[in-house]
């Protein structure tokens, strides 16, 4: 759809005659009837095709004609059309002297044509005015003309229809060659989709206007690229959302079972080194000196009795000294002055010549000890207890008081804490250095496999079109994270360009 | 009184070269669109080409499109045909005319004979 | 290309006779149509244009009719400088092209 302007701009008749030959009287009052057509071959009378128009009366003989279309006039005179500009055409203009005020042809004589001209013309849309001069032996019209399209179409021809929008249908301006020019912030054919903050995850972010970074279930962060962990996951993170991946030296389904006690609690004093042994359990190796479970108990260096021959033992700062009984002497009273004449040995020990009777040694009964049989057997200074047992001195004997999970003499055996079958619901035992591991069948969990759990709600494949599914452990239910272009529930949907445009 | 006259013509070679012109009077030769048509011994009348009243619009027949030229000088009010590789199909009778019919305008030149021959 | 087919390619007549010589188009040529005369020697002469427009100057025993393809002309009464050849034109598309001819002799 366009329109086919025509300025006229000067029409001489000096001699004020018709194309007869005749003088109009007084003058030519002049008008003019214009005709336009499709292109011919040859110009040939026949219907205007592309339409007609007429004017008023313009001057009388010769006269210049006033650009009036600022002021709402008729020149440029305009001649629309609502089809494909072909490019071609046929114009004819037609000069007539109207007698009187009736301008309708039926009402003039056949003889008051002035002139006529018909031409055939190229003309692009567009294109600057084309100036024009058709002369004759009596007349000469100077005129110029142009084609333009009509409000919201473009292109070579007017054929392009586009109408500018900032709607639910569209945010764009149009291009002088009808193309759609987006707003900015908006993309796409008819720059209905949102152009995203920028990052914002193509997979895990959308946005319904430009700039936004909204999150599919199971993503967050500023960009939706970072996942949201299982509800309740505690020292974990997730690549995908609702995983529970947990950090070193935890376990569990919420990573909230500590693996490494040791470093999470250091629980061992004095510089003792630390084992982990189990879910909350560790073994303090003592430096010397130390003792108790976490090694937080200082050991007295006499604790050791390291003064033999009844010597006493005085702590000092820097370590111990031993105080001899008569007849010996050494650091630790371990040289003796006497002989087995000197009736040595106590506790009912015998006595033996060493060393052609420079030196002698006590044999001693049961339960004492040390070179003179001085010493009850203290049967717990050997730490015979394993495991961590605590020794007792029990008389002539001893005992060894076990941890949980240890048994036997010296604690040397680990009870089965399987063997009562403590997992339910089918679970599997899993004996441990310290306690046991239930693995639970699906549907159950739990330390002992006592919680019933919903299914994986995954397993069904309740998403459509590709989306991929999430099983919130925490509700029992599944998440579908829908692709571009679907939504719904279960992505069920898709998201169809309207069926049609109002424009 | 109105003339069109044709000159131009002659024998030329196949492959030659040869310029028409149309001299025209006794009217505004500058108000209409003129046309060559040609006649080949013993055959009908054919079209050759068309330039409009101010030059801007051309058409010519398939078998000489490429080969053939047609321009105008309003100043001087005469029409030119330039034709070059030229072939003996290409032997005729050479018109200019100025048609419009819608004007009642129907002029034709007697016509110049090119002969292409070795 | 818009073809014309001439009918007849010749045709024997005698003086007061009424003729009529058609011409149709391979398509819809809209009333662009012309009928000429040709005279051994001469320039072809415009007898109608418009399908059924009398050119000035022409009598008034020729006459056109037709629309679409089908065209045609008459000569009511034939008189003897009427013996000559015939041929209609289409100006309705490029190319123009014209009709075979009719030879119009006396019998």
């Known amino acids: 759809s366009g329109v086919f302007q025509l300025q006229l701009q000067e029409f001489i008749n000096e001699r004020g005659v018709l194309a007869s030959g005749r003088p109009c009287e007084p003058g030519c009052r002049t008008f003019f009837r214009v005709c336009l057509k499709h292109f011919q071959a040859v110009v040939s009378p026949g219907p205007c095709t592309f339409g007609t128009v007429s004017t008023p009366v313009l001057g009388t003989n010769s006269f210049a004609v006033r650009d009036d279309s600022s002021g709402g006039g008729r020149n440029p005179l305009q001649l629309p059309f609502n089809f494909t500009w072909p490019g071609t055409f046929s114009l004819i203009i037609e000069a007539w002297h109207a007698p009187g005020d009736d301008l309708r042809p039926e009402a003039l004589p056949p003889d008051a044509l002035i002139s006529k001209i018909a031409i055939q013309g190229s003309l692009a849309v567009g294109q600057n005015w084309l100036l024009d001069e058709q002369t004759s032996t009596l007349t000469r019209l100077r005129y110029s003309y142009r084609v333009i399209c009509s409000d919201n179409y473009y292109g070579d021809n007017c054929s392009r229809l586009c109408k500018k929008r900032n709607d639910h249908f569209g945010h764009y301006v149009c291009q002088p060659d009808g193309n759609l020019s987006c707003l900015p912030g908006w993309t796409g054919e008819y720059c209905q989709q949102p152009i995203c903050l920028s990052g914002c995850h193509e997979q895990n972010g959308y946005c319904s206007k430009p700039a936004e970074c909204l999150c599919r279930p199971g993503w967050q962060g500023r960009l939706c690229n970072e996942c949201i962990p299982h509800n309740g996951c505690r020292h974990g993170t997730c690549s995908t959302p609702w995983q529970c991946t947990c950090d070193e030296g935890w376990g569990g389904l919420f990573c909230d079972q500590d693996l490494n006690y040791c470093t999470h609690h250091s629980p061992c004093k004095n510089g003792a080194t630390c084992s982990n042994s189990g879910q909350r359990s560790y073994t303090c190796t003592c430096r010397p000196g130390y003792t108790g479970v976490d090694c937080e108990l200082e050991l007295s260096e006499c604790d050791s009795n390291p003064c033999r021959n009844g010597g006493s033992c005085k702590d000092q700062e820097d370590g111990y000294h031993c105080l001899c009984p008569p007849g010996y002497y050494g650091l630790h009273c371990e040289h003796s002055t006497l002989s087995c004449a000197d009736s040595p040995c106590f506790n009912g020990g015998s006595c033996r010549e060493r060393n052609q009777g420079a030196n002698y040694a006590c044999e001693c009964p049961p339960n004492f000890t040390g070179s003179n049989c001085e010493k009850k057997v203290d049967r717990c200074t050997s730490n015979p207890c394993a495991n961590g047992g605590q020794c007792l001195n029990r008389g002539p004997s001893r005992m060894c008081r076990c941890r949980p999970g240890f048994t036997g003499t010296y604690c040397e055996l680990h009870v089965s804490d399987c063997a009562r079958n403590p997992c339910a619901h089918g679970g599997t035992c899993h004996d441990l250095e310290n306690g046991l591991m239930c693995t639970c069948p699906a549907g159950f969990s739990g330390r002992r496999c006592e919680v019933r759990t919903s299914i994986d709600a995954c397993a069904s494949s309740p998403c459509f079109n590709r989306a991929t599914c999430y099983t919130d452990l925490s509700t029992d239910t599944f998440v579908c994270n829908c692709p571009y272009g679907f939504v719904g529930s279960r992505c069920e949907f898709p998201v169809g360009l309207p069926p049609s445009f109002p424009w | 009184e109105v003339q069109l006259v044709e000159s131009g013509g002659g024998l030329v070679q196949p492959g030659g070269s040869l310029r028409l012109s149309c001299a025209a009077s006794g009217f505004t030769f500058s108000n209409y669109g003129m046309y060559w048509i040609r006649q080949a011994p013993g055959k009908g009348l054919e079209w050759v080409a068309f330039?409009?009243?101010?030059?801007?619009?051309?058409y010519y027949r398939d078998s000489v499109k490429g080969r053939f030229t047609i321009s105008r000088d309003n100043s001087k009010s005469t029409l030119y045909l330039q034709m070059n590789s030229l072939r003996a199909e290409d032997t005729a009778v050479y018109h200019c005319?100025?048609?419009?019919?819608?004007?009642?305008?129907?002029?034709w030149g007697q016509g110049t004979m090119v002969t292409v021959s070795s | 290309d818009i073809q014309m087919t001439q009918s007849p390619s010749s045709l024997s007549a005698s003086v007061g006779d009424r003729v009529t010589i058609t011409c149709r188009a391979s398509e819809d040529i809209y009333s662009n149509l012309a009928w000429y005369q040709k005279k051994p020697g001469k320039s072809p002469k415009l007898l109608i244009y418009a399908a059924n427009r009398l050119q000035d100057g022409v009598p008034s025993r020729f006459s056109g009719s037709g629309s679409g393809t089908d065209y045609t002309l008459t000569i009511s009464s034939l008189q003897p400088e009427d013996f000559a050849t015939y041929f209609c034109l289409q100006g309705s598309k490029f190319p123009l092209t014209f009709g075979q001819g009719t030879k119009l002799e006396i019998k």
């Open positions: 330039i409009s009243h101010g030059g801007g619009i051309t």
């Open positions: 005319a100025a048609l419009n019919w819608e004007l009642g305008i129907d002029y």
